[in-house]
C-alpha cells in the first residue's frame, strides 16, 4: 500500500523568537528514501530538513529518528523570525539509483503565521 | 576527530559471560545509532545487534537473540556489549561502529579480540 | 532475510578500473554501503547510502546500482586498495544489517 504522509494541522501560530513544532508523520518507512521539509512549492521551494545527517541550524527533529521503525518526522523550529513564515511540506522520497531521489507523497502542508511580540 | 575503541576482550571458558565496552568520542555519541559487529578468523563481517540514540530500541540478529544484549551509557559516552552462554562460534574480534542516518556504517573501531576456548 | 552475493575475487592491474559487484538485496527496502578491509586492520567505509563517499575516501571509489545489483568501481586502481571490500546492506523491511561474503581484490 501506498506511504501516506500526515501533517495534522493545517496552520500554526507562533510569536516571533519564540518555537515551534511541526507535525509530520508517515504510515510506512518504504520505499526506502529521505524525508524532507519543504516551504513553499514548485521550483522556488527552500528545503528547511533533512533527516539524512546534515546539520541546520535552529532546526532539530522532536523524535528519535534513529529508530529503525520511527515514523515520526516532525521538527522544531526556534527562535522564529517573520521570515519563517509560510506553508511547510512534509515530503517522503524515494532514493534514485543514479538519478536524484524521487519525491512519492507529500503531506498537505501546514501554514505557520508568525506574530510580532 | 571521530574515535572508537573498544575494550573488554580476552579468553574466557564455553559458558561464560563477558562484557565488551566501547568509548567514543569526537562526535555528539548521543545522537547516533551504534551498532556490533564481529569477525570469526578468517571469515567475514556479522552484524550482531544496533541500538537507537536514546537508547530505547534494541535489534539483533536471530542467532544472538536473548544471549547478548546491547546497551549505552550517554553521559558516559560509552556503548556496551553483554554476552553470555559463550560458545567456541563466538570466536572472533568485535567492532563498534557508529551509524548513519539510514543505519550503514560511517566509522569503526579497532576492535577487541574475544576467545572462547576449553 | 536476503543474502547478498559477492565474486570471491578480483584482479586488476595498477591504473585499471575495477568492479567488484553485489547482488541479492531488494532494492525497494535495502540501502547499500561499501567497506574496505586490509589484513589485520579495522574496516574503513568507502561508500555508504548507496553512493556517498566519506570526505576522506579519494574520488577514485565511486558506487552504483542498478535494480538489485549494486557496483563498486575503483577508477585508476592502485597497490594500497589491495584489500578485502565487504558490501554491507541495511534492509527497511527487517531491520536488520547484512554484509556480504566479502571480494579479495588483488593489484597484480
Known amino acids: 500500500t501506498e506511504v501516506k504522509v500526515t501533517q495534522p494541522e493545517k496552520s500554526v501560530s507562533v510569536a516571533a523568537g519564540d518555537s515551534t513544532i511541526l507535525n509530520c508523520t508517515v504510515t510506512s518507512l518504504l520505499p526506502v528514501g529521505p524525508i524532507r521539509w519543504y516551504r513553499g512549492v514548485g521550483q522556488s521551494r527552500l528545503l528547511i530538513y533533512s533527516f539524512t545527517g546534515e546539520h541546520f541550524p535552529r532546526i532539530r527533529n522532536v523524535s528519535d529518528t534513529t529508530k529503525r521503525n520511527n515514523m515520526d518526522f516532525s521538527i522544531r523550529i526556534s527562535n522564529v523570525t517573520p521570515e519563517d513564515a509560510g506553508t511547510y511540506y512534509c515530503v517522503k522520497f524515494q532514493r534514485g539509483s543514479s538519478e536524484p531521489d524521487t519525491e512519492i507523497q507529500s503531506g498537505g502542508g501546514t501554514e505557520v503565521y508568525v506574530l510580532a511580540k | 576527530d571521530v574515535q572508537l575503541v573498544e575494550s573488554g576482550g580476552g579468553v574466557v571458558r564455553p559458558g561464560e559471560s563477558l562484557r565488551l565496552s566501547c568509548a567514543a568520542s569526537g562526535f555528539t555519541f548521543s545522537s547516533y545509532a551504534m551498532s556490533w559487529v564481529r569477525q570469526a578468523p578468517g571469515k567475514g563481517l556479522e552484524w550482531l545487534a544496533g541500538?537507537?540514540?536514546?537508547?530505547?530500541?534494541?535489534y539483533y540478529i536471530d542467532s544472538v537473540k536473548g544471549r547478548f544484549t546491547i546497551s549505552r551509557d550517554n553521559p558516559k559516552n560509552s556503548l556496551y556489549l553483554q554476552m553470555s552462554s559463550l560458545t567456541a562460534e563466538d570466536t572472533a574480534v568485535y567492532y563498534c561502529?557508529?551509524?548513519?542516518?539510514?543505519?550503514?556504517?560511517?566509522?569503526w573501531g579497532l576492535g577487541t579480540l574475544v576467545t572462547v576456548s576449553s | 532475510s536476503y543474502e547478498l552475493t559477492q565474486p570471491p575475487s578480483v584482479s586488476v592491474s595498477p591504473g585499471q578500473t575495477a568492479r567488484i559487484t553485489c547482488s541479492g538485496g531488494?532494492?525497494?527496502?535495502?540501502?547499500y554501503a561499501w567497506y574496505q578491509q586490509k589484513p589485520g586492520q579495522a574496516p574503513v567505509t568507502v561508500i555508504h547510502s548507496d553512493d556517498k563517499r566519506p570526505s576522506d575516501i579519494p574520488e577514485r571509489f565511486s558506487g552504483s546500482s542498478s535494480g538489485t545489483t549494486v557496483t563498486l568501481t575503483i577508477s585508476g586502481v592502485q597497490a594500497e586498495d589491495e584489500a578485502d571490500y565487504y558490501c554491507g546492506g541495511y534492509d527497511g523491511r527487517t531491520y536488520i544489517n547484512t554484509f556480504g561474503g566479502g571480494t579479495k581484490l588483488t593489484v597484480l
Open positions: 531488494d532494492y525497494y527496502s535495502t540501502y
Open positions: 541500538i537507537s540514540a536514546g537508547g530505547s530500541d534494541t
Open positions: 561502529a557508529r551509524e548513519t542516518w539510514n543505519h550503514l556504517f560511517d566509522y
